[in-house]
């Protein structure tokens, strides 16, 4: 009947597999085990996907690739020591006396267990890329790392183009042989070697396993270099920028590294594979048994079919690669896995106007001259929405979008942010907080949940902070409930009276103009321009100040702009900012200076949006290298990324106010980038578009 075809990646492994197959057959274990010879783990994964083999044990990185690219699932996991179970932890260790944190690793000297090894390379490098601390251009991870650290010892990097930097701290053996070898010849190789590199002062940080420091300090039976070392002289770097004692690895680590696991096709019964292997380990995992599942000594190798340190195999309940790997490791792998051969040679940028085409063309030429990768190509579209369509259809790759467009791009077209813009603090017109301002009044204090029946002041109909966000937020929270999509009537019935200046007052509820005052002569009441004294953010605040309204929906800067002598107009000249407060979504009130913590939403910065299958790290890597050359508006390199004045336009490709492009970090979805409050407000409004 049924058989399970195990994939072996080498002759010794094939030999051990044959012995295991024979041992299982003699013990009457069913189904029968056959062995298929592959050339590598990658090749085996392809054979399994092609139904020419059924199972193989893989490490975390390979499980990620097999799951993501080929739909394989992990069904049986290895367990090593009882304390940590089916995983161990990758940590970054520093000397207690140093001031290094996870945020200041740039320029420090680094010690790694070896090139492409899990805790010494894959996890730390992947984590640094994924968190936005390390930018990688054109998938050249080695170059990025060699530029990032101030010299390293990465055993095995001697064959690479960046050995000068990556092997700078390596020392070889006592006679200077084997420098940077991925073998014990290099004294700084492996877990203990990388820690020794730190302990002897060659490096400032070592990327090792959670147990490494404790195994190599405090006078254990150690080689001479470690005998005087005390564990208390070292600390771990935590992801949040803090540091912790070396015993705190469960809370303070770069990632939990999953154990190796047996993977199969999605249509294979995982229970069957476990039952087969469980029978096997019951009979063949202890000392005197005729076949040793978890030993490779007889074949002159290590870790054949299973890791030699495996104490038992366990079934995996949630048979998805994501669940097995865990989010920390998964994120690190996302940052690391970048295949230069799969990297498209071009990044096609969406442009919307003739000036933007011109600027994009100049950007493409400037980037090419500096050998930045991938190269830019410029593709025209009619509108932001047309860009989104073309990106989704894979005719274009990237476009910079504003908040509302990011929402549409994410929700309707499935696009994701790859990089964002950051503006100087003075530039509050580009990214700002929407706040609800009230008078400080202890006797009649009310909260955001008690706005019904109050008088409201709005900058104008359709203004982001004056209308869209506050009304959307109140709809989303269930306070305002429009009937038949009639938002205007619902708002007019929710508030006792309002001033919401408007340009087209046809069918406009009268209560939305009830608080408006018009110009000095009382004319132009409720018009959507500055003739209405309560128009705009300044006007909405004035409406509150002059006691026409109880709450004003404005920008976070509005109160400061019109108090403390900042506005000399008679109505504002004597106002003090401390006489006003903000209404917070949690029902509290706060000082006006607390706008970052107490707001209805933040109008987000613009972001570069791409398809979800685009490698966002290569997009940010390109932009980050480019801004080093072209980001300063006064650079002498022949192109200005964040300036459009040469093209008789403004905000071309990027907003001119951009100070720098930033990584998205954890904000990898449109909702993450926009923030839940802003999304909620937009959803509140869009739920009414009938």
């Amino acid at each position: 009947g049924m058989e399970v075809r195990w994939c072996a990646t080498s002759d010794p492994e094939q030999h051990k597999c044959g012995n295991m197959s024979e041992a299982f057959r003699e013990a009457g274990i069913q189904p029968s085990l056959l062995c298929v010879r592959g050339t590598s783990a990658d090749h085996c994964v392809q054979l399994i996907a092609a139904q020419e083999a059924d199972a193989i044990t893989l490490d975390g990185g390979a499980i990620y690739e097999a799951g993501k690219e080929h739909g394989l699932k992990p069904v049986v996991g290895e367990v090593y020591d009882q304390e940590v179970g089916t995983s161990y932890y990758a940590v970054a260790v520093v000397r207690r006396s140093s001031h290094v944190t996870i945020d200041t690793l740039k320029g420090v000297k680094s010690c790694h267990t070896g090139i492409n090894r899990t805790v010494g390379w894959n996890v730390p490098v992947g984590y640094l890329v994924e968190s936005g601390r390390l930018s990688v251009m054109g998938c050249d991870v080695l170059k990025a790392v060699s530029d990032y650290f101030g010299g390293s010892c990465v055993p095995g990097a001697g064959e690479t183009s960046y050995s000068e930097s990556l092997c700078r701290l390596c020392r070889g053996d006592s006679s200077g042989e084997g420098v940077c070898d991925k073998s014990p010849l290099e004294r700084y190789y492996d877990y203990s070697g990388a820690f020794r590199c730190l302990a002897e002062g060659a490096g400032d940080v070592a990327f090792v396993k959670h147990s490494t420091v404790l195994e190599n300090t405090d006078g254990k039976t150690l080689p001479s270099w470690g005998q005087a070392l005390l564990s208390q002289d070292f600390e771990l770097l935590c992801r949040d920028g803090s540091r912790a004692d070396v015993t705190e690895w469960r809370q303070c680590h770069l990632a939990r590294v999953p154990a190796h696991a047996v993977v199969v096709r999605a249509d294979t019964d995982g229970g069957l594979i476990f039952r087969l292997l469980n029978e096997g380990q019951r009979l063949f995992s202890h000392e005197g048994s005729s076949f040793q599942m978890f030993s490779s000594e007889a074949y002159g190798q290590k870790d054949l079919l299973f890791k030699d340190s495996t104490s038992e195999l366990v079934p995996i309940a949630t048979q998805t690669y994501e669940a097995w790997l865990g989010h920390e490791y998964l994120h690190a792998m996302k940052g690391l896995l970048c295949d230069p051969n799969r990297l498209p040679p071009y990044l096609r940028w969406c442009v919307l106007s003739t000036p933007e085409i011109q600027k994009c063309g100049d950007m493409a030429v400037a980037f090419r001259r500096q050998r930045l990768k991938p190269e830019i190509q410029c593709v025209s579209a009619k509108s932001p929405q047309h860009c989104m369509e073309r990106i989704q259809a894979e005719q274009v790759d990237a476009v910079t979008l504003s908040g509302e467009d990011i929402y549409t791009a994410g929700k309707t077209y499935g696009l994701v942010p790859a990089a964002g813009e950051h503006y100087a603090p003075e530039d509050s017109s580009n990214s700002y907080y929407v706040v609800a301002v009230v008078r400080r009044d202890s006797s009649h204090a009310f909260t955001l949940d008690e706005l019904r029946g109050k008088r409201s002041c709005h900058a104008g109909f359709g203004s982001p902070a004056g209308w869209d966000v506050p009304v959307g937020a109140l709809i989303q929270r269930g306070f305002i409930r429009p009937k038949d999509c009639d938002v205007l009537t619902a708002v007019s019935e929710f508030f006792n009276a309002s001033c919401v200046p408007v340009n087209n007052p046809k069918n406009y509820p009268s209560s939305l103009c009830a608080l408006c005052v018009g110009d000095e002569q009382g004319r132009n009441k409720c018009v959507g321009n500055s003739q209405e004294r309560y128009y705009g953010y300044r006007g909405a605040f004035r409406c509150l100040v002059e006691n026409a309204g109880d709450v004003a929906f404005v920008r976070h800067t509005t109160v400061f702009d019109n108090t403390n002598g900042h506005n000399s107009e008679p109505w504002a000249a004597e106002l003090r900012s401390e006489d006003y407060e903000l209404l917070c979504p949690n029902g509290a009130r706060a000082e006006v200076s607390q706008f970052a913590a107490c707001n209805l939403a933040q109008i987000p910065p613009h972001a570069v949006m791409v398809r979800p299958d685009t490698n966002i790290f290569t997009v940010y890597g390109l932009l980050d290298k480019a801004q080093d050359l072209f980001g300063d508006d006064h650079n002498k390199n022949g192109f200005k990324m964040f300036d459009s004045s040469n093209y008789h336009g403004q905000d071309l490709l990027f907003k001119d106010a951009t100070v720098r492009a930033v990584p998205v970090g954890e904000k990898t979805t449109y909702r993450g980038w926009l923030g839940l409050d802003y999304v909620a407000a937009l959803e509140g409004m869009s739920s009414q578009q009938c």
């Epitope: 603090p425 003075e426 530039d427 509050s428 976070h556 800067t557 702009d561 200076s593 970052a596 100070v659």
Partner: antibody, heavy 119, light 112 residues
């Protein structure tokens, strides 16, 4: 009352990394913008960079390749690292705060710490 | 970068007399939000700089009203109506409309 206090070694060798920390009391570094400025002996002020309330950094392009500003919110501190220093980096280094209340002028400064680069 | 040029670089003043320092920017300091991000700082001998004036003309809390700021666009002035002994030091203008923020070279006020 907002107070800022710089700390770090007063002497750094050429080609090494200058490391300073600014400890803030009376305000949280998770709001506002937190800056470093330096002043060579007998000269004017030069802006180095900031770290924002959300942890985003901006560096003066003239120093960008050598500067790292980071923060430790648990200790209400932020730090400056300047790599590959030369004698030209000898200066008094100040930390300072910028907030919206004063339109992002630097309203509170540390007392400054003199860093000499010399072998 | 925006260049800030102060004049005079040295200003000897008699106690009780007015003093005026000029600051010129290489480009207009009016930002897109309409604000002008121009500040003045005082640095007494041996001390760290201290904010006097922000947004061209707003006095920071605790600053005596003998200090006043004015100007627009590219030309700005700091005035001291009656100089006192404690006003001795170097005065810097600074812009933050554009990044990086830049400072003038400083004007040294001394008592005649």
């Amino acid at each position: 009352q907002v107070q800022l206090q710089e700390s770090g070694p007063g002497l750094v060798k050429p080609s090494e990394t200058l490391s300073l920390t600014c400890t803030v009391s009376g305000d949280s570094i998770t709001s506002g913008y937190w800056n470093w400025i330096r002043q060579p002996p007998g000269k004017g002020l030069e802006y180095i960079g900031y770290i924002s309330d959300s942890g985003i950094t901006y560096y003066n392009p003239s120093l960008k390749s050598r500067v790292t500003i980071s923060r430790d919110t648990s200790k209400n501190q932020y730090s400056l690292k300047l790599s590959s220093v030369t004698a030209a980096d000898t200066a008094v280094y100040y930390c300072a705060r910028r907030t919206l209340a004063t339109y992002y002028a630097m309203d509170y400064w540390g007392q400054g710490t003199l860093v000499t680069v010399s072998s | 970068d925006f260049v800030m040029t102060q004049s005079p670089l040295s200003l000897p003043v008699t106690l009780g007399q007015p003093a005026s320092i000029s600051c010129r920017a290489s480009q207009s300091l009016v930002a897109s939000d309409g604000n002008t991000y121009l500040a003045w700082y005082q640095q007494r001998p041996g001390q760290s700089p201290r904010l006097l004036i922000y947004r061209v003309s707003n006095r920071f809390s605790g600053v005596p009203d003998r200090f006043s700021g004015s100007g627009s666009g590219t030309d700005f002035t700091l005035k001291i109506s009656r100089v006192e002994a404690e006003d001795v030091g170097v005065y810097y203008c600074s812009q933050s409309t554009a990044v990086p923020p830049t400072f003038g070279q400083g004007t040294k006020l001394e008592i005649k």
